[in-house]
């Protein structure tokens, strides 16, 4: 589908001191759906600070945040996710500053979890896998990954790889032998919903076997 | 209240371009993308393609892909539909419209008739 | 491209009576419960005014007498109740994948 912009561009608020951002969780909690916004600016002081989102809600014509620590949150099922919501920065009933924003642009997907890698001495190959909530899910349910991968002892020489898919296969010959790897996986929307980055998984963590000596090859 | 308010009707001829504008007011320029939609004679509705004023990012339809341009003035809240290489099948009614949502079009332009013909 | 479908081409109306507009779509235009459906109104010499949005929701200020229905490949538009000035062409329209595309129009007149 076309778009506007990267997945993960955000519309900046104006340029003042209230300026946030905010990502949604479709079918977060269930059938709930979440929205989390938080200032640019982290020593905003947000004590009498509140968010409002209105419009594109099924029922009700506003919703109100709770706030939690430096967060601004709401899990609700009366998104209507067609349409722009207008979010305020509000102190009382003063609206300091607002976004137009489509919540289905906006979607950050849970970490993907559960993820392995096996060697396959035969093939010569490790079969890295993992597994996503989002396979479950009725709405955000096509997710590009990001696997990136990199030798423990180089600091920030990752390798990246995208794929749709929750497997993939490392041909043993693209690395190292007797070598210890890093790896992890991060998912983003991809069809119809936009939106960012999700954390990435905890990191799994193997070891390349040695040169076979025999034939100089590796096994 | 919310208008888009188009340019004047205008006759080329084949292989020209044309460049038509949609002045957006009564709401905040930036909030809403803003489409292009064409209507050939007794036809039907063709979407073209759409610019997000905020970024200057587009989205075009392949069929017009390398024809069209579509750009923005954010100091006169206006857009711009610029269409080249112009031939009879080109004849057609253009609007602008904003995009309420992904993707629906919930304020429209007057309409821009662009002729072709040698 | 999605390719939509309108049926009928032209239908005439009882003023007071119900009138019926479907579109089907060559592929679905659904997301779970999302459906990226719209419908429009045009007379003669205007632009289109968006009736409907969403497949069931009513855009602000469009008489309730419109409404909307259904999903994936199906959809509905239906006048409950005619009047004089819902005479006019009638154009459904998806948004689920680019290019945009928009059916070939059903015209309602009087009867």
């Known amino acids: 589908e076309s778009g506007y912009a990267q997945n993960g561009d955000l519309e900046d608020a104006e340029l003042d001191d209230y300026s946030f951002s905010c990502y949604s969780q479709l079918e977060v909690n269930g059938s709930q759906h979440s929205l989390t916004c938080a200032f640019e600016d982290p020593d905003v002081n947000i004590t009498n600070l509140e968010f409002e989102i209105c419009g594109a809600l099924v029922e009700v014509k506003c919703l109100n945040f709770r706030k939690l620590q430096e967060i601004y949150f709401i899990e609700t099922k009366k998104f209507l996710l067609i349409g722009k919501s207008n979010i305020c920065v509000k102190v009382g009933e003063k609206s300091l500053t607002c976004k137009k924003i489509d919540l289905t642009t906006i979607v950050k997907p849970e970490a993907p979890f559960d993820l392995s890698v096996v060697y396959r001495e035969g093939a010569n190959d490790f079969v890295v896998t993992f597994n996503t909530s989002h396979l479950q899910k009725k709405y955000v349910k096509v997710l590009m990954h990001d696997v990136a991968y990199r030798q423990e002892k180089d600091e920030n020489k990752w390798t990246h790889v995208n794929l749709s898919s929750t497997k993939l296969t490392l041909l043993q010959r693209k690395l190292q032998p007797a070598a210890m790897y890093e790896i992890k996986v991060r998912s983003i929307p991809d069809h119809y919903f936009k939106g960012f980055w999700s954390e990435w998984s905890p990191s799994y963590y193997f070891r390349t076997p040695e040169i076979n000596n025999s034939s100089g090859e590796m096994d | 209240q919310v208008q888009l308010v188009q340019s004047g009707a205008e006759v080329k001829k084949p292989g020209a371009s044309v460049k038509v504008s949609c002045k957006a007011s009564?709401?905040?320029?930036?909030?809403?993308?803003l489409h292009w939609v064409r209507q050939a004679p007794g036809q039907g509705l063709e979407w073209m393609g759409g610019?997000?004023?905020?970024?200057?990012?587009?989205a075009y339809n392949q069929k017009f892909k390398g024809r069209v341009t579509m750009t923005r003035d954010t100091s006169t809240s206006t857009v711009y539909m610029e269409l080249s290489s112009l031939r009879s099948e080109d004849t057609a009614v253009y609007y602008c419209?904003?995009?309420?949502?992904?993707?629906?079009?919930?304020?429209w332009g007057q309409g821009t008739t662009v002729t072709v013909s040698s | 491209d999605i390719v939509l479908t309108q049926s009928p081409d032209s239908l005439a109306v009882s003023l007071g009576e119900r009138a019926t507009i479907n579109c089907r779509t060559s592929?679905?235009?659904?997301?779970?419960?999302?459906?990226?459906m719209h419908w429009y109104q045009q007379k003669p010499g205007q632009p289109p005014k968006l009736l409907i949005y969403?497949?069931?929701n009513l855009e602000s200020g469009v008489p309730d007498r419109f409404s909307g229905s259904g999903s994936e490949t199906d959809f509905t538009l239906t006048i409950s109740s005619l009047q004089a000035e819902d005479v006019a062409v009638y154009y459904c329209?998806?948004?689920?994948?680019?290019?945009?595309?928009f059916g070939g129009g059903t015209k309602v007149e009087i009867k």
């Open positions: 419209a904003r995009s309420g949502g992904r993707w629906y079009f919930d304020v």
């Open positions: 009564g709401y905040r320029f930036t909030d809403y993308e």
């Open positions: 610019i997000d004023p905020k970024t200057g990012g587009t």
């Open positions: 592929e679905s235009v659904s997301i779970h419960l999302l459906h990226l």
């Open positions: 969403g497949a069931s």
């Open positions: 329209q998806q948004s689920i994948k680019d290019p945009y595309t």
